[in-house]
Interface confidence: medium
């Protein structure tokens, strides 16, 4: 299980129309459910339940986004509509170039994502927890324009990190 180096870039537009970017670095793990490769895209926060329905929420976004899913405690969803792997697949089917799961409240999901799949996804499926997950969700919950860059080796250039 290789380390995934994730950079989350928050775009703040200035009155002049220019953008200032604030980059936060965090680490996760590439799961065996997906490929160990780099990916980048605009963050789309997805509710685990929102990945259940084959309805209006289908095909909502054009291809190339990074799905962020905060998994709930298993007892809050005792009969999930899809497995965690199924949810990752559904997100990729809808155009996600990568999926990041916050497993802080559902650590069992780590094993589910790492059970060697005969047919792993061709896109990365990363999981984060603890302080890294908190950093990620703090940014995502702002509901502002943000991008995620996932790399399987540390960023070459030193990046300025801002604690969000």
């Amino acid at each position: 299980k290789e380390t995934a180096f994730v950079e989350v870039v928050l775009f703040e537009s200035s009155p002049s129309g220019d953008y200032t970017t604030y980059t936060t670095g965090l680490t996760g793990r590439f799961s065996r459910a997906g490929a160990t490769l780099s990916a980048e895209g605009e963050i789309v926060q997805m509710h685990p339940l929102g990945l259940c329905n084959n309805n209006d929420e289908e095909d909502l976004y054009e291809y190339g986004w990074v799905g962020v899913v905060k998994l709930e405690q298993p007892e809050l969803d005792p009969k999930p509509c899809l497995t965690v792997l199924g949810k990752a697949k559904r997100a990729v089917q809808r155009g996600a170039t990568a999926v990041i799961f916050d497993v802080s409240e559902n650590p069992e999901a780590i094993d589910q994502l790492n059970q060697g799949s005969e047919d792993p996804l061709k896109r990365p499926v990363v999981y984060v927890k603890g302080a890294d997950a908190i950093k990620l969700m703090n940014i995502v919950n702002k509901q502002k324009v943000a991008r995620a860059r996932i790399q399987h080796r540390p960023p070459r250039q030193p990046t300025e990190y801002f604690d969000m």
């Epitope: 775009f11 703040e12 537009s13 200035s14 009155p15 129309g17 953008y19 926060q45 997805m46 509710h47 339940l49 929102g50 209006d56 929420e57 976004y61 709930e72 809050l76 969803d77 919950n141 702002k142 509901q143 502002k144 324009v145």
Partner: antibody
Framework: EVQLVESGGGLVKPGGSLRLSCAAS????????IHWVRQAPGKGLEWVGR??????????EYAAPVKGRFTISRDDSKNTLYLQMNSLKTEDTAVYYC????????????WGQGTLVTVSS | DIELTQPPSVSVSPGQTASITCSGD??????VHWYQQKPGQAPVLVIY???QRPSGIPERFSGSNSGNTATLTISGTQAEDDADYYC???????????FGGGTKLTVL
């Protein structure tokens, strides 16, 4: 059919109270955050407040003009949302809408037809 | 707190393109949603997250957001598009929804 239906509006005197209801059908109500939005006669839309789903903590948040006077609650077993309005003022006169938010996006994809609240002496 | 400003009215001839703007400081940092409201009816979401169109909304509706201005564009405007249009954003400090003042689109 996905639907929200408000009720409970009417005429009330300044300082009075009123409780609005919003009945949901056609979707799993408990999974969604629901908002109240109002519109004074001939005016624009104004956000009143929201309640998150229970799984998201059931947190309530309010617009400054109604904070401390209005209370939002939900009964997931009855698929119903409530807006308790106390210490009503004439400027609270409006059509009140309940609206469902898309998961994690405070964009409202389903709206009720609205219920008129008139505060007048 | 962000404030959203819309022109009170916009007129367009049938078949032409209508552009309705929504401006606010650093608006490009936010996700902007657009609602259509016809007289006596509840609002309808026509664009969310700057440019996403809900199912059932015609392709002639599109959105963009950059710098300080978000724009709702209706190409090939039809008589049925005659309505009020509101932009909105979610402001996270403090958490609350902010609506623009609304624009009355008149299809001549």
């Amino acid at each position: 059919e996905v639907q929200l239906v408000e009720s409970g509006g009417g005429l009330v005197k300044p300082g009075g109270s009123l409780r609005l209801s919003c009945a949901a059908s056609g979707f799993t109500f408990s999974d969604y955050g629901i908002h109240w939005v109002r519109q004074a006669p001939g005016k624009g839309l104004e956000w009143v407040g929201r309640i998150k789903s229970k799984t998201d903590g059931g947190i309530t948040e309010y617009a400054a003009p109604v904070k401390g006077r209005f209370t939002i609650s939900r009964d997931d077993s009855k698929n119903t949302l409530y807006l308790q309005m106390n210490s009503l003022k004439t400027e609270d006169t409006a059509v009140y809408y309940c609206a469902r938010a898309i998961y994690y996006l405070e964009a409202f994809d389903v709206w009720g037809q609205g219920t008129l609240v008139t505060v007048s002496s | 707190d962000i404030e959203l400003t819309q022109p009170p009215s916009v007129s367009v001839s049938p078949g032409q393109t209508a552009s309705i703007t929504c401006s606010g400081d650093s608006l490009g940092s936010y996700y902007v949603h657009w609602y259509q409201q016809k007289p006596g009816q509840a609002p309808v979401l026509v664009i969310y997250r700057n440019k996403q169109r809900p199912s059932g909304i015609p392709e002639r509706f599109s959105g963009s957001n950059s710098g300080n201005t978000a724009t709702l564009t209706i190409s090939g405007t039809q008589a049925e598009d005659d309505a009020d249009y509101y932009c909105a954003v979610w402001d996270d400090e403090p958490h609350h929804d902010v609506f623009g003042g609304g624009t009355k689109l008149t299809v001549l």
